[in-house]
């Protein structure tokens, strides 16, 4: 049902819904302050645009009682409960932030008019894909897809010569929410990923992993999981793998390999690590100084849908348009905003851009180094390190099938 | 170290003024609390200023408290108004530790007597 | 509210025995819990933090267990220098408190 928006008369409300299953397991805590620390910028912002205007966040608690996992598995309703809330106390803001399950976005958005913005540090299924009023500030697993396809068909760059198109996926269900949802996507055999390759097969207990590291009849060379090291670790210890064995880690949402004296662990030298370029000052930044590196991108999402909104009303308001109407409900997309740290670009459909960063260990140093990088906005590769110090031979990666000449 | 001073004897309705002095470490890089003990009663949180000067008060204390923090010397205050006999209490400042999982330093508090 | 029910108010221990105290939250917070130990007189002194991560310097005999709204403290062989008053904390959220810290449990040392 409609409810009416406190989004008029130069006072204007976010609805942040701050639930118990969460896409991370972060306190609530942080994603406070980062929403006060988002409205301190807005509202300064505004100000110095001689928009003498009131901003303010309405945070909503789930009560607990029901959705009680503190994952997502159990956040399905949760959403609609919150909003069932607010609706009740007649307490809708100009823009909802949160949720960040995919389970509760997509139940929300199916099961509500939305006549109102809805921005989500998370929900990164395919089911979100493609909604006309969500914005999703955590890179979803269709642009995670997208990069996987562009690099398997590069061969043309020094340190891969060969088109891939085969793999395994690694898939045992104990993931986290992001990677849940990014394995699920590869997985998905009406996927774009899918799609484009050859053979992939999910492997999904221990054993079947640990036997493909040196399975002599293995179909393809390379392995696709998501985590950090010490999940590959747990899984391969010390294993002996064959040479031509590539595992793709994803990881996006860390940025532990960029910290000052981060040495990479033997066991990573087999490794290809997918991530997000670290922002540049957001190691270092007071925002971050209390927040784990791997939690860092997911209260920033927050901080970052204040500004976003921010954005949004200031335009909204300098042209004199009203912003309980469609258009601004819309209007979240196909734009770059200021972010807290940096410009933030969102896609047609309302989905973050990033930099995606491929690195590898170097045999020599033992240090991780950028082997190339990706634009999720033009969906295209940059390579970095033209002669990579590579454990596998000649410093090229292998071809994904043993024996398979050149391309 | 943290150490609380202001503390004594107060009337009802009067202001109160705490100041929470700090050393060894920067207030820009943690959250301070206040926290308060009732004679032979448990503990109970008062409010927070975090590294980034954003404040949270319990519900109870948001309308007659305010923290505020001076990086400089290295201070923390909270001033609250209107003061009745149940604000009696030992008023304890207390830092969270770096990655806000407890209050991992605390002052050895300052007692405020609430009497007419 | 993140409200914070510990149990029992008191308790009493012979030496070398053990105890247990339990404390539970009105809603799910993970495993942001901390314990702390507070004698007459003196300011809290933190024990466990994580729910189950011992402080620095405190002995091995107190565990902490538990995750979501369940929370555990357990003291084994009990010594007299454990006679206090132990609080547990949710570190969870901020905002929307009223007040934090559970109720406290007094342990007496026979």
């Known amino acids: 049902s409609q409810v009416s928006q406190n989004c008029h008369n130069g006072s204007y409300e976010i609805s942040v819904l701050m639930m118990g299953n969460s896409a991370f397991a972060e306190p609530l805590k942080n994603l406070e302050d980062a929403v006060n620390e988002g409205l301190e910028i807005v509202r300064g912002r505004l100000q110095n645009a001689g928009l003498n205007v009131t901003v303010n966040a309405t945070f909503m608690y789930s009560d607990g009682l029901i959705h009680n996992s503190g994952d997502c598995r159990s956040s399905t309703c949760e959403g609609l409960d919150l909003l069932r809330k607010i609706s009740n106390a007649q307490r809708m803001g100009c823009v909802l932030i949160g949720p960040s399950c995919t389970y509760s976005t997509f139940q929300m958005y199916l099961d509500t008019e939305l006549s109102y913005p809805m921005i989500s540090a998370g929900s990164f299924g395919l089911s979100c894909d493609y909604k006309e009023t969500l914005t999703r500030l955590m890179s979803p697993a269709r642009k995670l897809m997208y990069f996987l396809v562009n690099f398997w068909k590069t061969n043309d760059l020094p340190f891969k010569t060969y088109s891939w198109s085969t793999s395994y996926v690694y898939k045992n269900g104990t993931e986290t929410e992001d990677c849940f949802w990014y394995l699920n996507a590869l997985e998905a055999s009406v996927s774009y990923f899918s799609h484009e390759l050859g053979f992939k097969v999910v492997l999904r207990q221990d054993k079947e992993f640990q036997d493909i590291l040196m399975d002599h009849n293995r179909k393809s060379n390379v392995i696709i999981m998501c985590g950090g090291p010490e999940f590959l670790y747990k899984l391969k210890g010390d294993r002996a793998v064959a040479e031509d064995i590539v595992i793709i880690l994803v990881d996006l949402f860390n940025d532990q390999y960029f910290e000052d004296n981060v040495t990479a662990p033997d066991y990573m030298k087999n490794v290809l690590v997918l991530t997000l370029s670290p922002g540049n000052s957001l190691l270092n930044s007071s925002f971050s100084r209390n927040l784990s590196p791997t939690k860092r991108d997911f209260a920033l999402a927050y901080l970052n849908g204040i500004l976003l909104f921010g954005h949004m009303l200031k335009i909204f308001l300098e042209n004199g348009e009203n912003i309980t109407t469609p258009k601004f409900a819309h209007a979240f997309r196909n734009l770059t905003f200021e972010g807290y740290d940096g410009p933030v670009t969102l896609d047609d459909w309302g989905d973050v851009d990033s930099t995606m960063v491929l690195l590898y260990t170097s045999v020599d140093t033992k240090k991780y180094k950028v082997l190339l990088t990706y634009d999720t906005h033009v969906n295209k590769t940059y390579p970095v390190d033209m002669s990579p110090t590579f454990t596998w031979k000649n410093s090229k990666l292998p071809n994904d099938i043993t024996g398979r000449g050149p391309q | 170290s943290v150490k609380e001073s202001g503390g004594g004897l107060f009337k009802p309705t009067d202001t109160l003024t705490l100041t929470c002095t700090v050393s060894?470490?920067?207030?820009?890089?943690?959250?301070m609390n206040w926290v308060r003990q009732t004679p032979g009663k448990g503990l109970e949180w008062i409010a927070i200023?975090?590294?980034?000067?954003?404040?949270y008060y319990a519900s109870w204390a948001k309308s007659r408290s305010t923290i505020t923090r001076n990086t400089s010397e290295n201070t923390v205050t909270l001033k609250m108004t209107s003061l009745t006999a149940a604000d009696t209490a030992t008023y304890f400042c207390?830092?969270?530790?770096?990655?806000?999982?407890?209050?991992?330093?605390w002052g050895p508090g300052t007692l405020v007597t609430i009497s007419s | 509210a993140y409200d914070m029910t510990q149990t029992p108010a008191s308790v009493e221990v012979a030496v070398g025995g053990t105890v247990t105290i339990k404390c539970q939250a009105s809603?799910?917070?993970?495993?942001?819990l901390a314990w702390y130990q507070q004698k007459p007189g003196q300011s809290p002194k933190p024990l466990i933090y994580?729910?189950?991560t011992l402080a620095s310097g405190v002995s091995s005999r107190f565990r902490g267990s538990g995750s979501g709204t369940q929370f555990t403290l357990t003291i084994s062989g009990v010594e007299c220098a454990d006679a206090a008053t132990y609080y547990c904390?949710?570190?969870?959220?901020?905002?929307?408190?009223?007040?934090?810290f559970g109720g406290g449990t007094e342990v007496v040392v026979k």
């Open positions: 200023i975090t590294h980034n000067s954003i404040t």
């Open positions: 994580r729910a189950s």
């Open positions: 060894g470490f920067s207030l820009s890089s943690h959250r």
């Open positions: 207390a830092r969270e530790d770096s990655m806000g999982y407890y209050f991992d330093l």
């Open positions: 809603q799910s917070i993970s495993n942001w």
């Open positions: 904390q949710q570190t969870y959220t901020n905002n929307h408190l009223d007040n934090g």
